[in-house]
């Protein structure tokens, strides 16, 4: 019946428009690591799929950092002459954006995002937590921001900047952050310390969003909420990187955190799901 | 109790196509709580993952890119079964092949293999 | 591909004492919220494998708990507090952080 006939459509990755990086690594994000030199190293950034500069803080990091900018595209451009940010009205979408929604063989109910290019709009998916595809935002806005077409018919990527129509440069936009602070975390970093049902007494940390720190509180061992760590460190980690901080009005955001080892993995791979 | 029994051929000769079936009982192959792999075995290559399908919204499936070219495994929902299928085989392909269930729900990991099949490619 | 690499190949054991299993991923499998996408397997003599550990340190159902995983970033440890002669076999870790799905090369642990 038609019932079977639809069952056994399978959605292959064989069909999908490949994304062309080299090396997996060149998907990650730049990453300083934990030390304060200040050293100058190249990165590939998969959204303006360029290399570019970036400090680098002489320790720990990721594969994604080339001493010279040669090397940066000799391991994660195909054609060096390609330039990624073309001479045209539109900017082209990351290859990824085509890529049809893919829930992952784990089954954790994360909300997230991802571009229909049926629509052409960024939808609502439940992700499983594991693997999928890069077609994954977090948010509704950074899915927009990095596939929908603009109302110009230019791209709006992820770091606040537009392609300029006129002459393809990239010009910072407005934020528009409505308060001197705002949160871009995981949105459980929001809710308060629930300590569940259970009779138990453990020791665990919560992110207080009022205060913007990680504080300590008594988990009963079962229920409870995802604001919730078994360390203060992974709390921080988890939470305090997404209190963003204004420059100024209209100018661009920087996150406010101290200069330490924050993970980098490939954007669509920062995921939370509790132990169940 | 899931089990998996697979079950074809032993010996195949080059250049033809490897054909394995794995028989899913205390699961369902359309389940949304597992997904369905091909993994093999031999002394040169260790275990090696092949591929997997698993059903969601619909179905998915993902395969290795050293047999992507050469690979299918597909859901028979009314025998509730899954199949591999290998193109073009060669003498590299001779391995112990394994179905596994990969478990969606809480333990995250292959927690049902079948009992193997010995694949030998030889005219 | 993310590259498993176990050590060592080889574990001679005696019963009763503990064994540890050293499992290094050329990427990183740990989130930052905590996730370890890693899990260890044992396949005895004759038998398939089976799954003993998953998302780095939970215990599968079934398998006794002087079973233990442990590890972060890209260093994974299984321990065996006491071995026993059933314990016998090759272990494998796998990662399932990225496709493709890679296993490591295996341990292989014998009694003494």
């Known amino acids: 019946d038609s019932e079977e006939d639809e069952e056994h459509t399978i959605i292959t990755d064989t069909e999908l428009p490949p994304l062309k990086l080299m090396h997996s690594f060149c998907a990650f994000k730049a990453d300083d690591g934990p030390c304060k030199a200040i050293m100058k190293r190249f990165f590939f950034n998969i959204f303006t799929r360029q290399c570019e500069e970036f400090i680098y803080g002489g320790c720990e990091g990721n594969q994604n950092r080339f001493e010279s900018l040669e090397e940066c595209k000799k391991m994660c451009t195909r054609d060096n002459a390609n330039r990624i940010i073309k001479t045209t009205l539109q900017q082209e979408k990351p290859d990824f954006c085509f890529l049809e929604e893919d829930p992952g063989i784990c089954r954790g109910y994360i909300t997230r995002y991802f571009y229909n290019n049926q629509t052409k709009q960024c939808e609502r998916f439940k992700y499983g937590g594991c693997l999928g595809n890069m077609n994954n935002f977090e948010t509704l806005e950074e899915c927009k921001n990095i596939c929908e077409d603009g109302p110009n018919g230019f791209q709006v990527d992820n770091y606040g900047t537009q392609l300029n129509a006129v002459n393809n440069s990239l010009t910072p936009q407005s934020t528009k952050v409505p308060s001197l602070f705002e949160f871009h975390g995981p949105s459980w970093c929001l809710t308060p310390a629930d300590r569940g049902l259970c009779r138990a007494n453990e020791n665990r940390f919560y992110y207080n969003s009022v205060i913007g720190k990680c504080r300590p509180f008594k988990y009963s061992g079962c229920g409870g909420n995802e604001n919730n760590f078994t360390s203060k460190q992974e709390c921080l980690r988890a939470c305090k990187k997404g209190f963003i901080q204004r420059i100024s009005k209209g100018g661009l955001i920087k996150t406010k955190r101290k200069r330490k080892k924050q993970r980098v993995k490939i954007a669509y791979e920062e995921i939370f799901v509790k132990n169940m | 109790q899931v089990q998996l029994q697979q079950s074809g051929p032993g010996l195949v000769k080059p250049s033809q196509t490897l054909s394995l079936t794995c028989a899913i009982s205390g699961d369902s192959v359309s389940s949304n709580s597992a997904a369905w792999s091909w993994i093999r075995q031999s002394p040169g290559r260790g275990l090696e993952w092949l591929g997997i399908?698993?059903?969601?919204?619909?179905?998915?499936?993902r395969y290795a890119v050293s047999v992507k070219s050469r690979i299918t495994i597909n859901p028979d929902t009314s025998k509730n079964q899954f199949s591999l299928q290998l193109n073009s085989v060669t003498p590299e392909d001779t391995a112990v092949y394994y179905c596994?269930?990969?478990?969606?729900?809480?333990?995250?990991?292959?927690?049902?293999w079948g009992q193997g099949t010995l694949v030998t490619v030889s005219s | 591909d993310i590259v498993m690499t176990q050590s060592p190949l080889s574990l001679p054991v005696t019963p009763g004492e503990p064994a540890s299993i050293s499992c290094r991923s050329s990427q990183s499998l740990v989130f930052s919220f905590g996730i370890t996408y890693l899990n260890w397997y044992l396949q005895k003599p004759g038998q398939s494998p089976q799954l003993l550990i998953y998302k780095g340190s939970n215990r599968a159902s079934g398998v006794p708990d002087r079973f233990s995983g442990s590890g972060s970033g890209t260093d994974f440890t299984l321990k065996i507090s006491r071995v026993e002669a059933e314990d016998v076999g090759v272990y494998y870790c796998?990662?399932?952080?990225?496709?493709?799905?890679?296993f490591g090369q295996g341990t292989k642990v014998e009694i003494k």
């Open positions: 596994a269930r990969w478990h969606s729900d809480k333990m995250w990991g292959f927690d049902d």
């Open positions: 399908i698993y059903k969601r919204s619909k179905w998915y499936n």
């Open positions: 796998q990662q399932y952080d990225s496709y493709p799905l890679t």
